[in-house]
């Protein structure tokens, strides 16, 4: 049996930040689970991990240099990514593994979310063009 | 039996244009086929069509307002997209149907290609700041 995951097909990060909500066909209450977000068509980069345990506080971390936070709902995990670069525009996949209580469950691969990082393209002020050569 | 399709996982369109090559596990020589490119995780937008017929010239067209051209190889079709907008950053899927000779064949869904349209972000020249209020 597999958990189904729903994600928004596309999100635009105008200010280099985005909330990506992963919705599961499974209630995570009182479960020990590992929810993760993966970048790229090959899911090669593990962007962020949310580790949930019935007895402990939620653990959120990234081992790949992303600035991320996570929030838990009964049937969802929301990843909040900040300080994204324009070149981090890509497809991002939600993944979930429920370890305890058994049996182990994971998800059918989701369709993913295209995160388009538009960022802020700052132009120098025309009144203050910056230092010039004498 | 299904045709397998290979695409580059990601392409960046710096100048609002990109070449997307769809490579097939099938030789299109002397076949009647319809190769198409689809935008979005749901493949909802048919971006461009290349119709090949052993007796006629290649037909390339878009019914969705994209500026596209196509080039045929023995086992590939390359779509050349121009005048892309930044907000057309998305995932693009190659599709192929071989109509003749029988049997009809189409492809296993490919992984797709993220096309990141960076465009040109022009800043006004600091020497010519443009009109100002009197």
């Amino acid at each position: 049996n597999k958990i189904l995951v729903k994600q928004s097909p596309m999100l635009v990060a105008y200010d280099n930040a985005v909330n990506l909500s992963c919705k599961y066909s499974y209630n995570l209450f009182s479960r020990e689970f590992r929810a993760s977000l993966h970048k790229g068509l090959d899911s090669a980069v593990e962007v962020c991990v949310v580790y949930g345990n019935y007895s402990q506080q939620l653990q959120v971390y990234s081992k790949t240099g992303f600035n991320c936070d996570g929030k838990l709902g009964n049937e969802s995990v929301t990843f909040y990514l900040q300080n994204l670069y324009v070149n981090q525009t890509d497809i991002y996949f939600c993944k979930i593994e429920v370890m305890y209580p058994p049996p182990y469950l994971d998800n059918e691969k989701s369709n993913g979310t295209i995160i388009h990082v538009k960022g802020k393209h700052l132009c120098p002020s025309p009144l203050f063009p910056g230092p010039s050569k004498p | 039996n299904k045709i397998l399709v290979k695409q580059s996982p990601m392409l960046v369109a710096y100048d609002n244009a990109v070449n997307l090559s769809c490579k097939y596990s099938y030789n299109l020589f002397s076949r009647e086929f319809r190769a198409s490119l689809h935008k979005g995780l749901d493949s909802a937008v048919e971006v461009c069509v290349v119709y090949g017929n052993y007796s006629q010239q290649l037909q390339v067209y878009s019914k969705t307002g994209f500026n596209c051209d196509g080039k045929l190889g023995n086992e590939s079709v390359t779509f050349y997209l121009q005048n892309l907008y930044v907000n057309q950053t998305d995932i693009y899927f190659c599709k192929i149907e071989v109509m003749y000779p029988p049997p009809y064949l189409d492809n296993e869904k490919s992984n797709g290609t993220i096309i990141h349209v960076k465009g040109k972000h022009l800043c006004p020249s600091p020497l010519f700041p443009g009109p100002s209020k009197p």
Epitope: Y100, P101, P102, P103, D106 | -
Partner: antibody, heavy 120, light 111 residues
Framework: EVQLVESGGGLVQPGGSLRLSCAAS??????????VSWIRQAPGKGLEWIGE???????YYSPSLKSRVTISRDNSKNTLYLQLNSLRAEDTAVYYC????????????WGQGTLVTVSS | DIQLTQSPSSLSASVGDRVTITCRAS??????????LHWYQQKPGKAPKLLIY???SLQSGVPSRFSGSGSGTDFTLTISSLQPEDFATYYC?????????FGQGTKVEIK
């Protein structure tokens, strides 16, 4: 036939590190449905679970050892590894790897064990 | 962590005796009607061997004189007629929550 063979045990200095291997055959470490745990047994004592790795590569560790332990694997060699740092005398034990299936998580196959002695 | 307490810690018995070992969990190890409690046998210098899984299911190849029962927090391993090769140490183990834990063991010795 499923087999697990541990290696890498021996005498280690206090404060040192150990890296044990567990070569699996008869099943793939990266195929869904099975995972592998490391378990240890101090001389004359009971069994202590160290941690586990799932087919996905996700790992879980005993809270009491988490800061010192790393479980990893090499899919190409179908081999599992246990790295334990900052060793002390109480880490002296026979170290076992054991396979479990995802439904009940019972350990249905065990290796023969490898003895690690921490002493100066 | 879930604590498992076995009793007795050791016992002396004769060949042919009926032997019962109990395992008590500090909280229920049941989920959706399944008890995630297993029993192992270990002989000196050897790795443990799975006897019973999910409280009462006999592992393939294990003699039918071994049986398990119980649910929730209280479990029992029974050897209906003790054989010479059954003299060993027996452990219960829970897999309901991590960290997985074992009982302290029950040593079955020859009287």
């Amino acid at each position: 036939e499923v087999q697990l063979v541990e290696s890498g045990g021996g005498l280690v200095q206090p404060g040192g590190s150990l890296r044990l291997s567990c070569a699996a055959s008869g099943f793939s470490l990266s195929t869904g449905g099975v995972g592998v745990s490391w378990i240890r047994q101090a001389p004359g004592k009971g069994l202590e679970w160290i941690g586990e790795i799932y087919h996905s590569g996700s790992t879980y560790y005993s809270p009491s050892l988490k800061s010192r332990v790393t479980i990893s694997r090499d899919n190409s060699k179908n081999t599992l590894y246990l790295q334990l740092n900052s060793l002390r005398a109480e880490d002296t034990a026979v170290y076992y790897c054991a396979r479990y299936e995802y439904y009940y998580y019972d350990f249905d196959y065990w290796g023969q064990g490898t003895l690690v002695t921490v002493s100066s | 962590d879930i604590q498992l307490t076995q009793s007795p810690s050791s016992l002396s018995a004769s060949v042919g005796d009926r032997v019962t070992i109990t395992c008590r969990a500090s909280q229920s190890v049941d989920f959706h009607g399944i008890s995630f409690l297993h029993w192992y046998q270990q002989k000196p210098g050897k790795a443990p061997k799975l006897l019973i899984y999910a409280a009462s299911s006999l592992q393939s190849g294990v003699p039918s004189r071994f049986s398990g029962s119980g649910s929730g927090t209280d479990f029992t391993l029974t050897i209906s007629s003790l054989q010479p090769e059954d003299f060993a140490t027996y452990y219960c183990q829970q897999s309901y929550r991590s960290p997985r834990t074992f009982g302290q063991g029950t040593k079955v010795e020859i009287k």
